[in-house]
């Protein structure tokens, strides 16, 4: 039970006090007791329950009421059973007893009131009225945890607007309200109670810029809302009528968890005694609700796809046809960003990452806009954000970004268990340098901080700065699987490729050509590739880099070797010893459920079939996956990217609720 106030009683005059239902009020009977009295007894109205803690009771009176010694060890607490119909309608009488004097009486007139701030602390999607209880003041994780949840109102329900809903202090309509969390203030008081008392709703100054609270005012025609708390307003006096009354508030978060904001927001209602005009208002009671702002959550390749995004650029019609066909097979919506909107920037994966936010009453997809800001920079904000589709961005919006701030360098694993630690929403993966140096690249700290602050997908830092482009999607991917952990990790593997080529040469196919059918491209014989010592040295270096990540992933995701599939791939080292794919990078694939869009490698044709394609199919088809090889050579590969880099996917949110995990 929540702590109420301390009431001091005195024999000199009657004491008037307010007792809030559901709170434990302490009664100080000692400090004003007559000097020659040594004990006291208590009589109460039926609506008051008094509890006296002292063992043993001093003496049982014949009338049936007990007396207790007046000493510091005695604790008198009281609670009320119901709200009062009129002011002071409940009474407590303290009788002080002494050896030589008649009993001295002290009177306490109590007014019982019900004042409670309620929200969906049980996370059921419904607000249940709660009396003042301690639990509302703490937010706990896990299936037995409790505490309310707020969504950042980061969508744009008004198509005419260019701003997110949380950027204005208006409620557009009932649709906008659904993005907010309901909070109800329930009061039950005597009719004249608020002539002498006031309620104030408030939020800490440190949190006022993270939240906005609207009060629903029921008009005759429609339900209107007005801002009562927000970035410019940390407190608001409430006009509450006497009697029984419910007041609804709608709460929206304005900021995601981040470095200096753990995501917790406490809203408090304070009851003030304003009866003495010549004195300052005194706090009589407070009730609080703690909300946690829902984190932004990424979805791995194992989640069902819902929508595919791709750019239309000069001469990529065939690529578009292939992606369209794949999306149809996977029963996905397809969104094509036209040339006039992408400004010749085809790297859809790099511009944005689509995740979601969730509260018990609402789930919202949210696009995380990278700070790379090239030709596609307007696409997330103008075309993706909209009604019930939120938006967030981090990092410098002008300059100061590196290639590692693009979101081809941001992936998430499927759910994993590492030892005793469960990651039911997977773990975020991003690439970094091995160590900081004058020219090393790393993901911008603002992005790293944001990802870590979400708490539910603890990030793992991989090593990707060895690549020309520097993105983790150049050497890893995840595909769904029917067995084991429900997925496989795919890693690009020069070792596997050399092994395959060596086998083909041993079988007499050393003259088979890589890049057959590619115009203006030097075709390479298997035997020449195998005998090129420089290329071998380069791939030996690449293998070491990938192996470093392999061990890191095994450790951080709790994987065994049998959870990993090696995809044959060669790389070449270019300027400044940075690596890029020697032939189209097959691991950089589009995963749409069981349908995979894999860059066509243009490997050596043996017995009428590309040996690289054949090898990959033999590795993935037993998992029930369907491989489609997409020609991206001229439009993507030679521009340092592949199918995954050129596409993006919105996926179905996890069925697992983030608040049920323990980070």
């Amino acid at each position: 039970m929540a702590q109420g106030t301390l009431i001091r009683v005195t024999p000199e005059q009657p004491t008037h006090a307010v007792c809030v239902l559901g709170t434990l009020t302490q009664l100080d009977v000692c400090s004003s007791a007559p000097e020659d009295c040594t004990s006291f007894s208590v009589n109460t109205s039926p609506g008051v329950v008094v509890d006296i803690a002292h063992s043993p009771p001093a003496k049982k009176k014949s009338t049936g009421s007990s007396t207790w010694p007046l000493d510091p060890g005695v604790e008198v607490t009281l609670t009320m059973k119901a709200a009062s119909g009129s002011t002071g309608d409940q009474k407590v009488q303290i009788s002080y007893h002494g050896p030589k004097t008649p009993p001295v009486k002290a009177l306490l007139y109590l007014t019982g009131v019900e004042i409670s701030l309620s929200a969906d602390i049980t996370r059921t999607g419904k607000v249940k009225p709660t009396r003042a209880v301690e639990d509302k003041r703490t937010w706990t994780w896990g299936p037995c945890g409790q505490g309310a949840i707020l969504l950042v109102n980061c969508d744009r329900d008004n198509p005419e607007s260019s701003a997110m809903d949380c950027e204005d202090d208006e409620v557009l309509d009932s649709k906008d309200l659904k993005d907010m969390s309901l909070m109800t203030l329930s009061t039950k008081t005597p009719q004249d109670f608020f002539t002498r008392h006031t309620l104030v709703l408030h939020v800490a100054r440190s949190e006022m810029d993270k939240v906005r609270v609207f009060q629903a005012t029921r008009g005759r025609l429609s339900s209107r809302c007005r801002v009562v708390l927000g970035p410019k307003q940390p407190s608001h006096y409430l006009m509450v009528p006497g009697g029984k009354h419910n007041m609804d508030f709608y709460v929206e978060a304005l900021a995601f968890p981040d470095t200096n904001f753990p995501g917790l927001i406490t809203l408090t209602v304070s009851m003030l005694d304003t009866s003495k005009l010549e004195l300052p208002e005194a706090v009589v009671f407070q009730d609080s609700v703690v909300f946690r702002v829902a984190p932004w959550i990424m979805t791995p390749n194992t989640q069902p796809p819902q929508e595919v995004y791709v750019c239309s650029i000069f001469e990529n019609e065939d690529f578009l046809k292939s992606v369209t066909a794949l999306a149809m097979q996977a029963r996905c919506k397809l969104t094509i960003c036209p040339e006039e909107e992408n400004m010749d920037d085809q790297w859809m994966q790099d511009e944005m990452e689509i995740g979601y936010i969730q509260a018990p009453h609402k789930t919202l997809p949210v696009v995380f806009d990278s700070p790379r800001n090239r030709g596609l920079k307007e696409f997330p904000i103008k075309r993706v954000m909209g009604p019930d589709f939120g938006y967030v961005t981090r990092g410098p919006q002008t300059g100061g970004v590196s290639g590692l701030d693009s979101f081809g360098n941001l992936e998430v694993s499927p759910p994993v268990t590492v030892g005793d630690k469960e990651y039911p929403l997977g773990r975020i993966l991003f690439g970094d340098s091995c160590y900081p140096s004058s020219d090393s690249r790393e993901m911008h700290q603002a992005l790293q901080d944001f990802l870590s602050a979400q708490q539910v997908q603890a990030p793992v830092k991989l090593y990707s700065d060895w690549l020309t482009v520097g993105h983790v999607d150049e050497f890893l991917s995840f595909v769904p699987a029917p067995d084991r952990k429900g997925f496989r990790l795919l890693l690009a593997s020069p070792r596997s490729c050399y092994k395959l080529f060596q086998e083909q040469q041993n079988e007499g196919h050393g003259d088979a050509l890589l890049f057959q059918g590619i115009k203006k491209k030097n075709q390479q014989k298997i035997k020449n590739i195998l005998s090129n010592t420089t290329l071998r040295e380069h791939n030996s270096f690449v293998e070491r880099c990938i192996d470093w990540n392999r061990e890191l992933l095994k450790r951080e995701l709790g994987l065994a070797e049998s959870d990993i599939i090696d995809i044959p791939q060669l790389f070449k080292l270019k300027e400044f010893s940075k690596a890029e794919a020697f032939f189209p990078n097959m691991v950089n694939m589009l995963v749409l459920g069981k349908h995979l869009g894999i860059p066509k490698p243009f490997g050596p044709i043996i017995n009428g079939r590309c040996c690289l394609e054949e090898k990959v199919c033999s590795l993935l088809e037993p998992l029930g996956l369907h491989c489609t090889f997409i020609n991206d050579f001229y439009t993507y590969h030679i521009r340092h990217g592949e199918v995954h880099c050129g596409t993006n996917v919105r996926r179905k949110p996890f069925s697992f609720k983030w608040w049920n995990m323990v980070p």
Partner: antibody, heavy 128, light 111 residues
Framework: QVQLVESGGGLVKPGGSLRLSCAAS????????VSWIRQAPGKGLEWVSF????????YYADSVRGRFTISRDNAKNTVYLQMNSLRAEDTAVYYC?????????????????????WGRGTLVTVSS | QSALTQPRSVSGSPGQSVTISCTGT?????????VSWYQQHPGKAPKLIIY???ERPSGVPDRFSGSKSGNTASLTISGLQAEDEADYYC???????????FGGGTKLTVL
């Protein structure tokens, strides 16, 4: 063959800023590595900065790191050199130079380390 | 002071050969085959004449040749002609935090 034209030079006070542009014609700059090299009056060449064709990494000389930023806008076929906190010793003719990033190369061709096309240069004078 | 060391000046008569040296360290010239040479006439932009130690861009006469031994690279101009009079700069990729280094330049005078 690509042609390069530098612009944006001029007189600036110490501590000031300038942005140099290197505009390309005759070819798509996105296929090229681009470097800035400078030459102080009567002195030798000094390599300043580099950006790769894929626009994914940059390098700087110790003398300018933290003050200069190289960037490219492939849609505008232009590379920029943003120069902040300029000092008297930054006074020089600034040349933009490029080398084609040939995807056919099997192994490191070193194209990022040499400059086969040069602009005419733009003079930057830092003086109070 | 430049990172790569070149002689201040060399000279030769028309028809003769001259060699310009460029000395670096094990971390640049000695480590990489990414040495290039540039010719610069007064008031003009430099022009690439040798790259990757000994390769010549198209249009550069075969009188210009490059080589490397240990930490020293060399440019040899045979059959000197009057128009060869210019400043010559060597350059190399480097392991240092400045990844491309130039020599101080050599003034070639054709007598």
């Amino acid at each position: 063959q690509v042609q390069l034209v530098e612009s944006g030079g001029g007189l600036v006070k110490p501590g000031g800023s300038l942005r140099l542009s290197c505009a390309a014609s005759g070819s798509t700059l996105s296929d090229y590595f681009v470097s800035w090299i400078r030459q102080a009056p009567g002195k030798g060449l000094e390599w300043v900065s580099f950006i790769n064709a894929a626009n994914t990494f940059t390098y700087y000389a110790d003398s300018v790191r933290g003050r200069f930023t190289i960037s490219r806008d492939n849609a505008k076929n232009t590379v920029y050199l943003q120069m902040n906190s300029l000092r008297a010793e930054d006074t020089a003719v600034y040349y933009c130079s490029s080398a084609n990033d040939d995807v056919d190369d099997i192994v490191a061709p070193g194209r990022g380390y040499y400059m086969d096309v040069w602009g005419r240069g733009t003079l930057v004078t830092v003086s109070s | 002071q430049s990172a790569l060391t070149q002689p201040r000046s060399v000279s030769g008569s028309p028809g003769q050969s001259v060699t310009i040296s460029c000395t670096g360290t094990r971390g640049d010239v000695g480590r990489y085959n990414h040495v290039s040479w540039y010719q610069q006439h007064p008031g003009k932009a430099p022009k690439l004449i040798i790259y990757n130690v000994y390769e010549r861009p198209s249009g550069v006469p075969d009188r210009f040749s490059g080589s490397k031994s240990g930490n020293t690279a060399s440019l040899t101009i045979s059959g000197l002609q009057a128009e060869d009079e210019a400043d010559y700069y060597c350059s190399s990729h480097s392991r240092s935090s400045t990844p491309v280094l130039f020599g101080g330049g050599t003034k070639l005078t054709v007598l």
